[in-house]
């Protein structure tokens, strides 16, 4: 397949990735599905610079990212290694808090109002950010 040369309309380019910032809220799974339907994934934060870039665009608003521990260990949706990668949790987080009374703990990560991360109930309707890589091969069949 061919490589994507530029970002789709309404997406923002940064360091060879394209980002789309929602203005409405969805549960984590719905946000994850939305990004997948756009041939993208929930944002995966791999560096100081990417954290700052995303933080600038979302402002002080709770926003889902592509990090969860619904199957046990924390995992990035694109397979990026969590243990060795960039982390920006708030102090005392993640805490898998059960005291919210909604059933279960907290298995999905989001940006908080100061940009640092928190784990929360995945059903909360937060904004989200989709990311896709510019050098990712598109799904279109090659021209013959």
């Amino acid at each position: 397949g061919s490589e994507r040369a530029c970002c789709p309309v309404n997406w923002v380019e940064h360091e060879r990735s394209c980002y789309w910032f929602s203005r409405s809220g969805k549960a984590w799974a719905d946000a994850d599905n939305y990004c997948r339907l756009e041939d993208a994934h929930l944002v995966v934060v791999t560096s100081w610079e990417e954290q700052k870039f995303v933080q600038h665009h979302i402002g002080p608003v709770n926003t889902w990212m592509g990090l969860h521990d619904q199957n046990g260990p924390w995992k990035w949706v694109d397979g990026t290694d969590y243990e060795t990668g960039f982390k920006n949790w708030r102090p005392e987080q993640p805490d898998d808090w059960y005291g919210h009374g909604l059933g279960g703990g907290e298995d999905c990560a989001h940006f908080t109002d100061d940009g640092r991360w928190n784990d929360d109930v995945c059903q909360r309707p937060y904004r989200w950010v989709c990311e896709t890589e510019l050098d990712k091969a598109s799904q279109e069949p090659p021209l013959l």
Epitope: W48, F53, P91, G115
Partner: antibody, heavy 118, light 107 residues
Framework: QVQLVESGGGVVQPGRSLRLSCAAS????????MHWVRQAPGKGLEWVAI????????YYADSVKGRFTISRDNSNNTLYLQMSSLRAEDTAVYYC???????????WGQGTTVTVSS | DIQMTQSPSSLSASVGDRVTIACRAS??????LNWYQQKPGKAPKFLIY???SLQSGVPSRFSGSGSGTDFTLTISSLQPEDFAIYYC?????????FGGGTKVEIK
């Protein structure tokens, strides 16, 4: 009151090692990232390193990478800078500073002087 | 690495003057720019963060502006205690970098 106090500076020969300490008080040390910043005599400020509140991330200036190690002991409210293979150009006043939102430094210590000389 | 260039490197001004210091980044740093004040023999003092937000306790005569690559620190009416060296600092990218400083002297 919020306070940072550096110690451990002194005169050391090139190639030798030194460990600086920064004692924090008046705030919840374990909730804040911390920096080391240095200032050579008569020169400007040079950032050295940062460590996250929980030690999960550490970043260094290119000039010290591989020679200096930043660490912390949250149980003792202390920040450290282990300096090895010291060079004359490492001579400076070393400040520790509290991090504000990945990079800003809102509280500073009074500094400790390191002189690298034979 | 992102280079930070301040201008002028020094300036002379009188009490009551309006003073402006410029800081330019070698690449876009959005609004991740801080300002510090340092007096001789003392540690730096945090003045302004994210280009224009005044740190708690800093007099309102200090203000910051700019985004992208060009930033400004303004002292609306210079006071005797404002004579010092001022540094800008970018926090968009590591390694974090400071400008070379601007010395504000008494005319």
């Amino acid at each position: 009151q919020v306070q940072l106090v550096e110690s451990g500076g002194g005169v050391v020969q090139p190639g030798r090692s030194l460990r600086l300490s920064c004692a924090a008080s008046g705030f919840t040390f374990s909730s804040f990232g911390m920096h080391w910043v240095r200032q050579a005599p008569g020169k400007g400020l040079e950032w050295v390193a940062i460590i996250w509140h929980d030690g999960s991330n550490k970043y260094y200036a290119d000039s010290v990478k591989g020679r200096f190690t930043i660490s912390r002991d949250n149980s003792n409210n202390t920040l450290y800078l282990q300096m090895s293979s010291l060079r004359a150009e490492d001579t400076a006043v070393y400040y520790c500073a509290r991090d504000l939102s990945m990079g800003g430094m809102d509280v500073w210590g009074q500094g400790t002087t390191v002189t690298v000389s034979s | 690495d992102i280079q930070m260039t301040q201008s002028p490197s020094s300036l002379s001004a009188s009490v009551g003057d309006r003073v402006t210091i410029a800081c330019r980044a070698s690449q876009n740093i959005i609004s991740y720019l801080n300002w510090y004040q340092q007096k001789p023999g003392k540690a730096p003092k945090f003045l302004i963060y994210t280009a224009s937000s005044l740190q708690s306790g800093v007099p309102s005569r200090f203000s910051g502006s700019g985004s992208g690559t060009d930033f400004t620190l303004t002292i609306s009416s210079l006071q005797p205690e404002d004579f010092a060296i001022y540094y800008c600092q970018q926090t968009y990218s590591t390694p974090l970098t400071f400008g070379g400083g601007t010395k504000v002297e008494i005319k």
